[in-house]
């Protein structure tokens, strides 16, 4: 058993049918010594008397808010949550497996640049009685500070008769050094509590591996005289790290016809312009990627040929 926050405790339970459970001793936070009784949640049934209460925690029915009283007055509360292990595996019931980039991916994180700022998000089908708390550090043995905000509901989606909720959090490394080679990974830890169920989820990554630039900005077409060719130009996104001479991007330019089945013409360039043939009803799209490290491509920025 360990304390999650004041008066809230997590009991780690290795559950299997007929498991003996965990013995837990609760102590009433009072100078009083006698006349103390204990109840659980809204029930008035007295579970025991005395300054301490010993319980055997075998299942969620044994979790909840234990209250000690004296003469009708509440003295203190202890909320017991369960963290359940089954077949040697901690439960992951609260969050949805996003299965990208691999199975058992519950947290996904991205950074728009090398500033040490990143966003993580996760999915759940649970709509009520749900709280999250996020902590982060660089390294785990001698951790360096990363500050995370509060997790917020960022999107709701309907998939069939499924409703899915996306939560996200923004974190910032306290002493980020954008140009430095990373040797210790960022660790992100999310505590999730649903009703009386506690679960924790972790992710470990280098900023360089989660980089996803914003799309190129200011995408423009300039027709070339007496030609079907156009000059496409764009700029680095505002959110990308500077100076651009050091934090360089490479670009992919794509000409796509109206029909998805039409052949796509693609050009790769390190410049911020390219010359392509603009077909009728086609569109031109450009996306960006770190020039020296193969992390994710940005989303496409697009303009119609016409």
């Amino acid at each position: 058993i360990w304390e999650l926050k004041k008066d809230v405790y997590v009991v780690e339970l290795d559950w299997y049918p007929d498991a003996p459970g965990e013995m837990v001793v609760l102590t009433c936070d009072t100078p009083e010594e006698d006349g103390i009784t204990w109840t659980l949640d809204q029930s008035s049934e007295v579970l025991g008397s005395g300054k301490t209460l010993t319980i055997q925690v075998k299942e969620f029915g044994d979790a909840g808010q234990y209250t000690c009283h004296k003469g009708g007055e509440v003295l203190s509360h202890s909320l017991l949550l369960l963290h359940k292990k089954e077949d040697g595996i901690w439960s992951t019931d609260i969050l949805k497996d996003q299965k990208e980039p691999k199975n058992k991916t519950f947290l996904r994180c991205e950074a728009k640049n090398y500033s040490g700022r990143f966003t993580c998000w996760w999915l759940t089908t649970i709509s009520t009685d749900l709280t999250f708390s996020v902590k982060s550090s660089r390294g785990s043995s001698d951790p360096q500070g990363v500050t995370c905000g509060a997790a917020t509901l960022s999107a709701e989606r309907v998939r069939g008769d499924n409703k899915e909720y996306e939560y996200s959090v923004e974190c910032q490394e306290d002493s980020a050094c954008p140009a430095a080679e990373e040797s210790l990974p960022i660790e992100v830890m999310v505590d999730a509590v649903h009703k009386l169920k506690y679960e924790n989820y972790t992710s470990s990554f280098f900023i360089r591996d989660i980089i996803k630039p914003d799309p190129p900005k200011n995408l423009q077409l300039k027709p070339l005289k007496n030609s079907r060719q156009v000059e496409v130009s764009w700029e680095y996104p505002d959110t990308w790290s500077t100076p651009h001479s050091y934090f360089s991007l490479t670009f992919c330019v794509q000409v796509q016809g109206k029909s998805k089945r039409e052949k796509k013409d693609r050009v790769f360039t390190d410049k911020t312009s390219a010359t392509v043939i603009c077909r009728k009803n086609a569109s031109i799209s450009v996306r960006a990627q770190d020039r020296y490290y193969s992390s994710s491509w940005s989303e496409w920025a697009s303009v119609p040929c016409s």
Epitope: F60, T125, D161
Partner: nanobody
Amino acid sequence: EVQLVESGGGLVQAGGSLRLSCAASGRTFSSDAVGWFRQAPGLERVFVAAIRWSGGSAYYADSAKGRFTISRDNAKNTVYLQMNSLKPEDTAVYYCGATSLFPSSRGSHYDSWGQGTQVTVSS
């Protein structure tokens, strides 16, 4: 919200068997497990057994061990309670409920209760 409908109750002689069904519809994915409870006249609802939708782990009250078996058919979104060697004291209305807390024997942890199915065991 999950909707639950029980069926399969009836009158049976002591020593006989019954299989109860609990058909679930709606947001079944939002609950981890389904449990069976029973309520004899004038008494409170008492836990019998529960099963997870995924993984199939089952949890039984001491009074149900050895005689009752809970199972599920995910394709049919149905949970079954096979009751053997029935005794007169098994007479009750049997309810199923959904929970996101498995295992739990506490009725307040369950919701979306069905309307119940009557089981009567005669001696």
